[in-house]
């Protein structure tokens, strides 16, 4: 059977499989998932192993029809890098020498300067190119050699391996060699990998149920470090409870060097973020940490310092400490917005069974902010989703330039942020450079501010706007409002009428719904348009809504179903990647986020057209 | 170590290096003319395993903060006299798990 990393390397024009006869003869034949001759598999960036033989695809030169051969596999030698080139070419890295059929006189595949149909080639059984089932490095824990990645094949005891093993072992712990040759090298580390045993690398907090673990011994950088940490369905160390850090300055009393935790500032446009998407609630930074040099976007924990937290450069090379199980978070539910009959008093702004409201013109300290919210019954507002925070900014009129206090606030525990309204803080999306709680200043208040409406921490004794929330009253059978401009059941934002097509569809289907209602699948044009819609689906229970994004016409060039421009974009973390596709918004903890998935899996989907009764504004110039 | 039929003995191990963590210990041993067999191992958890010819009489312990297995045999016979040796399974700097003691020999006079 194929293990998900192994291909078949196919021929459309010919209908064959690459096949590696002997070392000397790589040919091809009629495709076979089960011959152990067609299997390959990328065993570096650049580098494909036949999984027979345990050898590397390469040549004898970079020159016009020569063979190409097995060779042991060299990470260093220019005779074995290939590169996916255009579409479903494979070429010999930074040279137009392409992996070709060969022909009737030879049977061997050959390096060919023709880039012709002989030269395509696709993983079996699939569209895909060949970099599509690409490599990804495992990095080991232990072991003795700080962390490195698994060289794939490496040799032990003069025997080559493809595979972590537990050679040498009685107890089926796995491990690789970090180079292709352990016998000389002696360097190794344990596989990322569930085994028997493989539960004592985590400790757990017998009080939460969470386990950690702690790679003191590691050298990686933070972005390493977390590819780490999620190889083994874990994340980068979030810290969200004083309990946690409490346990966590224990686990690591007996170490001395800083140790990356998830906490960065690596998104361009907001502050401080803990990478598991956590909330960032509690603070425990080293005195005079944050600097704010540029740069020093990830954070480090310092066992010698009373695990306090210090932002450093995300190259540095530390030891890092991983997290998984039950998030410490507290289950907290925020009902959908379609569960809920919302009906508020006037001037307040339903939405998912609470009410809203701005209070913009009567500037008050936080305070009385707090006391005026609630008098009118309700509290300061608390948000626990990225689709609250997008009602606010696109339906509530929200301005880029408002500042207003919300109701997050450290005044009860300093360092530990908290709801006035009591509810647990379940998200946070801080400014650039916030939390700053400057100590020259006490900053125990926060406020929202800026065109995306990110937060930051606040003397709170400043006079300024401030946004109540409070819950709505249910009274009797609700009401549907056709908006003006909207047909039943659309709902409008600003120029558009948008409905939420509830039949799952594949793509097309999805996109012929839409054109059957004079619609279209949505377009994004905006950060606020993307704030309105993340609003709109993000609390449903559904996982995909289809947008109209996709690069079916052309692979890897997106574009919308209508003739217009992709002018704003909203990638999830590792999207769109090399994966063709349509484009689903994600619900959820990633709600509104943009996906790549296959075009015909099924999802609901926002349809959109332009309100009856509105002037087109002119098109854009460039 | 020489000891008495009927007597009693008590064998200890410790296991020291880089060690991150002993997944198992155990005894073994090996009587003149005879292959190695296991007579009693115990898991990190604490599961035991012994060879039927000392069940009931012998029982291996360890103390997991000192890295160390021991051995209490009890109602010795002449057939318990063999080199016993200690045997660790551990994680530690290189690929290799199993870790052997040098052997001590035990006599049982009748």
């Known amino acids: 059977l194929l293990d998900t990393r192994q291909f078949l390397i196919y021929n459309e024009d010919h209908k064959r499989c690459v096949d590696a006869v002997s070392p000397s003869a790589v040919q091809t034949a009629a495709c076979n998932q089960d011959a152990e001759s067609q299997k390959f598999r990328w065993v570096s960036e650049s580098q494909i192993m036949s999984v027979a033989f345990k050898l590397c695809l390469g040549v004898p030169s970079k020159t016009d029809w020569v063979a190409i051969t097995l060779y042991a596999c060299d990470s260093k030698s220019e005779f074995q890098k290939w590169e996916c080139k255009n579409d479903t070419l494979l070429g010999i890295k930074g040279e137009d020498l392409f992996f070709n059929y060969g022909n009737r006189q030879e049977k061997n595949i050959m390096l060919y300067k023709g880039s012709g149909l002989w030269s395509r080639w696709k993983i079996y059984g699939t569209t895909d190119n060949l970099c599509s089932r690409g490599y990804e490095a495992m990095y080991t824990l232990l072991g003795n050699a700080n962390g490195a990645t698994c060289a794939f094949p490496f040799k032990f005891e003069n025997k080559w391996y493809a595979d972590c093993t537990s050679a040498g072992r009685s107890d089926g712990w796995l491990w690789c060699g970090t180079t292709t040759d352990y016998d000389t090298d002696k360097l190794f580390g344990y596989c990322p990998l569930k085994f028997e045993g493989s539960e004592s690398l985590w400790n757990k907090d017998p009080l939460t149920s969470v386990s950690y673990q702690i790679n003191s011994k590691s050298a990686l950088t933070w972005h390493q470090a977390r590819k780490s940490c999620q190889q083994q369905n874990a994340e980068l160390l979030s810290i969200t409870e004083i309990h946690e850090q409490t346990y966590l300055t224990g686990l690591t009393s007996s170490l001395t060097s800083g140790l990356w935790i998830g906490l960065n500032s690596l998104s361009f446009n907001s502050g401080w973020q803990w990478s598991d998407r956590s909330p960032f609630r509690y603070l425990n930074w080293l005195p005079g940490s944050p600097s704010a040099e540029p740069g020093k976007s990830c954070v480090s924990l310092n066992p010698g310092k009373n695990a306090k937290w210090e932002n450093l450069e995300c190259v540095q090379k530390l030891g890092y400490i991983c997290k998984k199980g039950n998030t410490t978070l507290n289950s907290f539910v925020i009902p959908s917005e379609s569960d809920v009959p919302t009906h508020c008093p006037s001037q307040w702004w339903p939405y998912a069974g609470h009410c809203y409201k701005i209070h913009r013109d009567e500037k008050k300290i936080q305070r009385d902010a707090l006391t005026t919210c609630r008098k009118e019954g309700g509290d300061l507002t608390s948000i626990h989703t990225i689709e609250e925070l997008d009602f606010i900014i696109s339906q509530l009129g929200y301005e880029p330039n408002d500042e207003l206090w919300i109701g997050l606030n450290d005044i009860k525990i300093q360092m530990y942020f908290e709801w006035s309204d009591g509810t647990p803080v379940t998200f946070t999306k801080w400014l650039r450079g916030e939390p700053s709680h400057e100590n020259n200043r006490q900053e125990d208040c926060v406020v929202m501010k800026g065109k995306d409406g990110y937060w930051a921490d606040r003397g709170c004794e400043w006079p300024l706007g401030y946004i109540c929330k409070m819950k709505s009253r249910s009274q009797g059978p609700e009401i549907v409002e056709v908006e003006k401009g909207c047909r039943k059941g659309w709902k409008k934002h600003h120029f558009y009428c948008y409905m939420i097509g509830h039949t799952l569809s594949t793509f097309a289907e999805a996109n012929q719904t839409c054109n059957n209602e004079n619609a279209y699948l949505t377009t994004i044009e905006d950060r606020y348009e993307q704030a309105f819609l993340t609003s709109f689906v993000g609390l449903r229970p559904e996982k995909y809504f289809w947008t109209g994004l996709s690069d079916i016409q052309t692979k890897g060039t997106f574009q919308w179903t209508i003739e217009e421009e992709v002018r704003f974009t909203h990638w999830n973390s590792d999207m769109p990647g090399r994966k063709p596709g349509c484009v689903a918004m994600r619900t959820g903890i990633a709600g509104g986020l943009w996906d790549v998935l296959k075009c015909d899996e099924k999802a609901k989907f926002v349809c959109k057209h332009w309100a009856e009764g509105v002037t087109h504004p002119p098109k854009p110039t460039t | 170590q020489l000891v008495e039929s009927g007597g009693s003995l008590r064998l200890s191990c410790a296991a020291s290096?880089?060690?991150?963590?002993?997944?198992?210990m155990g005894w073994y041993r090996q009587a003149p003319g005879k292959q190695r067999e296991e007579v009693a191992a115990i898991t990190s958890g604490g599961s035991t395993n012994y060879a039927d010819s000392v069940k009931g009489r012998f029982t291996i312990s360890r103390d997991n903060a000192k890295n160390t297995v021991y051995l209490q045999m009890n109602s010795l016979k002449p057939e318990d006299t063999a080199v016993y040796y200690c045997k660790a399974v551990v994680v530690t700097t290189t690929p290799y798990s199993d870790y052997w003691g040098q052997g001590t020999l035990v006599t049982v006079s009748s």
């Open positions: 290096g880089s060690i991150f963590t002993i997944n198992a």
